[in-house]
Interface confidence: low
């Protein structure tokens, strides 16, 4: 698998992974003890036909072109977890691995 | 996890899974021996804020609202394989499980 990496200076218009630091304090998410911020990344850009398509299914739907099907969109195709210390709903402190918090790769699906 | 199922008569505008039969013969994909057609399904519809969001990451990016980030889009969140008989690039006949050929669930990511 392959995905483009960009930054805020990139002129790339196609589907790409951009850096993004999420700051929980800035959001007022005070129920998260640690980390207070982390590198989440995000996906943005255009999905031209066949570019970075993760699944053969995406190509097939494009071929079949059913009513109402949008073109593929730029979305995470590989994500990874982070470990977090946080309060659950019972005010207990939990240490756990939270899935799909970091975008490792972007693609068109 | 939860996802909506719709059909061509549905009035649902939100992100939904729709039925779609892919016909390889109609595409001229003569390198696929079997099946000649299969139920692939596809995703279509609007992703209002928080509706059917698969990952907490999607919500966080929406909060952070970086330059160029589009809203979440309606995309497969669960897919399954099908068994296929097909030619590889060396004209050999292969029987194999091809991943991510069927959309089982749609969501916003």
């Amino acid at each position: 698998d392959f995905g483009l990496d960009c930054d805020e200076h990139s002129t790339e218009s196609r589907c790409c992974r951009y850096p993004l630091t999420v700051d929980f304090e800035a959001f007022g998410w005070d129920w998260i003890i640690a980390p207070k911020r982390y590198k989440a990344n995000y996906c943005s850009g255009e999905c031209e036909f066949v570019f970075l398509q993760k699944y053969p299914h995406t190509h097939l739907v494009h071929q079949a072109n059913p009513r109402g099907s949008a073109g593929p969109c730029c979305t995470p195709t590989k994500m990874s977890p982070i470990n977090m210390l946080y309060f659950n709903g019972k005010e207990q402190i939990i240490y756990g691995k939270i899935p799909a918090m970091v975008v490792d790769r972007c693609g068109c699906s | 996890d939860f996802g909506l199922d719709c059909d061509e008569h549905s009035t649902e505008s939100r992100c939904c899974r729709y039925p779609l039969t892919v016909d390889f013969e109609a595409f001229g994909w003569d390198w696929i021996i079997a099946p000649k057609r299969y139920k692939a399904n596809y995703c279509s519809g609007e992703c209002e804020f928080v509706f059917l969001q698969k990952y907490p990451h999607t919500h966080l990016v929406h909060q952070a609202n970086p330059r160029g980030s589009a809203g979440p889009c309606c995309t497969p969140t669960k897919m399954s394989p099908i068994n296929m008989l097909y030619f590889n690039g060396k004209e050999q006949i292969i029987y194999g499980k091809i991943p991510a050929m069927v959309v089982d669930r749609c969501g916003c990511s």
Partner: antibody, heavy 124, light 107 residues
Framework: QVQLVQSGAEVKKPGASVKVSCKAS????????MHWVRQAPGQGLEWMGN????????NYNQRFKARVTMTTDTSTSTAYMELRSLRSDDTAVYYC?????????????????WGQGTLVTVSS | DIQMTQSPSSLSASVRDRVTITCKAS??????LSWFQQKPGKAPKSLIY???RLVDGVPSKFSGSGSGTDFTLTISSLQPEDFATYYC?????????FGQGTKLEIK
């Protein structure tokens, strides 16, 4: 070496049928799609359809679908193209061509070997 | 069906000239285009596939370019054996369709 040898020229009356053969040698006949293309005198090339000898599955150009049948005989490594209800505008050279598949996508192929062609003349 | 339009339909050139033939598809065919050479009374011969890849054994004076809807075949230095008719073919979808041909003649 890989070779496709076609049957000889035919003269047919309008309304008749013709069956052109294409004998393959030098490769595994069942593993490659065989296509048929025709060319009217002084005209361009027109794709008629194809057949996969491994299982006999064929795809036809809609223009010929009602009149054409493509078959294979794997025991003799021969492909056949039968065209029925012949008209004068079916007068053409009919070619078989082997599809060579080089990639992994649906259109990753090209015609690498052609038969010498069979002239079919339709005249009353 | 996808229409393939070749231009020019005929072309006069001299030995050692550089010539370009174009082929236009009525819709996007990605890079799924082949070029053929045909001499009178002979079967077509494949030159280029996937728009720009040279078939084994074909001299490098032949080159192809383009993607989407617009494609070109270039012969860099014409030799007497290159005077023939050239066809493009789209193999992006069935039915396969050919261009109407370009007849390359000696000036």
């Amino acid at each position: 070496q890989v070779q496709l040898v076609q049957s000889g020229a035919e003269v047919k009356k309008p309304g008749a049928s013709v069956k052109v053969s294409c004998k393959a040698s030098g490769y595994s006949f069942t593993g490659y799609f065989m296509h048929w293309v025709r060319q009217a005198p002084g005209q361009g090339l027109e794709w008629m359809g194809n057949i996969y000898p491994y299982n006999g599955v064929s795809n036809y150009n809609q223009r010929f679908k009602a009149r054409v049948t493509m078959t294979t005989d794997t025991s003799t490594s021969t492909a056949y193209m039968e065209l029925r209800s012949l008209r004068s505008d079916d007068t053409a050279v009919y070619y078989c061509a082997r599809r060579y598949y080089y990639g992994t996508g649906p259109a990753d192929w090209y015609f690498d070997v052609w038969g010498q062609g069979t002239l079919v003349t339709v005249s009353s | 069906d996808i229409q393939m339009t070749q231009s020019p339909s005929s072309l006069s050139a001299s030995v050692r000239d550089r010539v370009t033939i174009t082929c236009k598809a009525s819709q996007d065919i990605n890079s799924y285009l082949s070029w053929f050479q045909q001499k009178p009374g002979k079967a077509p011969k494949s030159l280029i596939y996937r728009a720009n890849r040279l078939v084994d054994g074909v001299p490098s004076k032949f080159s192809g370019s383009g993607s989407g809807t617009d494609f070109t075949l270039t012969i860099s230095s014409l030799q007497p054996e290159d005077f023939a008719t050239y066809y493009c073919l789209q193999c992006d979808e069935f039915p396969l369709t050919f261009g109407q041909g370009t007849k390359l003649e000696i000036k």
